[in-house]
Interface confidence: low
Amino acid sequence: RKIPKVGHTFFQKPESCPPVPGGSMKLDIGIINENQRVSMSRNIESRSTSPWNYTVTWDPNRYPSEVVQAQCRNLGCINAQGKEDISMNSVPIQQETLVVRRKHQGCSVSFQLEKVLVTVGCTCVTPVIHHVQ
Amino acid sequence: GITIPRNPGCPNSEDKNFPRTVMVNLNIHNRNTNTNPKRSSDYYNRSTSPWNLHRNEDPERYPSVIWEAKCRHLGCINADGNVDYHMNSVPIQQEILVLRREPPHCPNSFRLEKILVSVGCTCVTPIVHHVA
C-alpha cells in the first residue's frame, strides 16, 4: 500500500505533554460540548414506519451512568393503513460510544475505557430472502 | 459528579464521585464485535429511507474515523422502488462520547468530548400543519 503524498509538513512536538505512566493515558472527564442537545424531528420513534421504545440503563460504576437504548417495537414495518407488514423488517441501527468504567479491586480503584454499542433507533428494510435449492 | 457505592471495609478517603481527571489503561475494552458500520450491515442500501455514509477523519480525536449518515431522499422508497413524498426520510441522531487530544498532539492525554452524529435514517409520517 502506498502512502498518499501530502508534502513534508510534520506536526510540531508539543512543548509540554503531561507525564503519563507507561500503558496508561490521562483522561479529563469534564465533557467538551456537555450542553449540546439533539435536535431530532419530534417523536420520530412513534412516527416511524419502524417504531421503537427507549429503555434507560443505569450503572453507577459507569461514566456516564445513564445510557439510553432503543428497541424496535415490531418485527415488521407499519404500512399506510397502520398495520404491521411482515414482508418488511424493522431493524436496529447501532452506534459505538465510549464510557469510563470504574473497577473496584479490594480497596483500590482503577478506570478502564470501554466501547459500548448503543441502539439508536430502527429503520425499515427490505428483507434478504435466501432461496434454498 | 456521579455517586459511586463505596466498599464498606475501605478507608473513608475514597471520593464517592468520579474524579475530574483519571488515569485509564490504554487497552480499550471492546464489548462489541462489529466496529465498522460500513461493513457491519447493508441497511443503508436496503432501508426504505436509505442513506449514504460520509467519512469524517480527525487525527486529534479517538476514534479518528467516524461515519456520518446523510439521507438520500426527502421522501421514502415505496414498494415500486419510487420515492414517495407523502412520507419523510429523517436522520436518527445520537450523542456519542469520543476522546479529544488535550493538549493537542499529545499521544496519551485526552478529554472526553460529546459529539452529535447522524447514525442512519428512518421513514416517518410527516407532521401536517393545517392552516385555519
Epitope: I3, G23 | E57
Partner: nanobody
C-alpha cells in the same frame, strides 16, 4: 518525557544489510502507528515505511519497496526496519516516529509528532 530510541545504524557496503530498532521503553505508543523516516544531508526528512498499531498494515516508499521490511514486536515495544540490498542513496540519518492518531491506523505522513534522536546509516564502498 516520551522517548523513542533508535539503534542499529552503522557503515555498510552496497548490497549489504542492516536492522534498525526503535524502542518505546515507556510503552507510550503501543496504540499508535509507527514510521521510519530518513534525512540525507541538505535534504528534507522523507518517509520510508510505516506500520499500524496491530502490525497488520504496512506502507513503504517506492524507493525502498522490496528491499526494506518494517515490523513490530508488541511484547518488546519495539519497531524494526530490516534494510537489505542497501544502496549509497540510502545514506541518511534514520528517525523513528509515532503517529498521533490514537486508533493506530497508518494513513498520511504528516501527523507524526514524536521522534527519536536518529541513527546514522552510511552505505559506502
Amino acid at each position: 518525557e516520551v522517548q523513542l530510541v533508535e539503534s542499529g545504524g552503522g557503515v555498510v557496503q552496497p548490497g549489504g544489510s542492516l536492522r534498525l530498532s526503535c524502542a518505546d521503553s515507556e510503552r507510550s505508543f503501543s496504540f499508535n502507528a509507527m514510521g521510519w523516516f530518513r534525512q540525507a544531508p541538505g535534504k528534507e526528512r522523507e518517509f520510508v515505511a510505516a506500520i499500524s498499531a496491530t502490525g497488520d498494515d504496512t506502507y513503504y516508499a517506492d524507493s525502498v519497496k522490496g528491499r526494506f521490511a518494517i515490523s513490530r514486536d508488541t511484547a518488546r515495544n519495539t519497531v524494526y526496519l530490516q534494510m537489505n540490498s542497501l544502496k549509497p542513496e540510502d545514506t541518511a540519518v534514520y528517525y523513528c516516529g509515532a503517529r498521533v492518531n490514537f486508533d493506530g491506523t497508518v494513513s498520511y505522513t504528516n501527523d507524526y509528532a514524536y521522534w527519536g534522536q536518529g541513527t546514522q546509516v552510511t552505505v559506502s564502498s
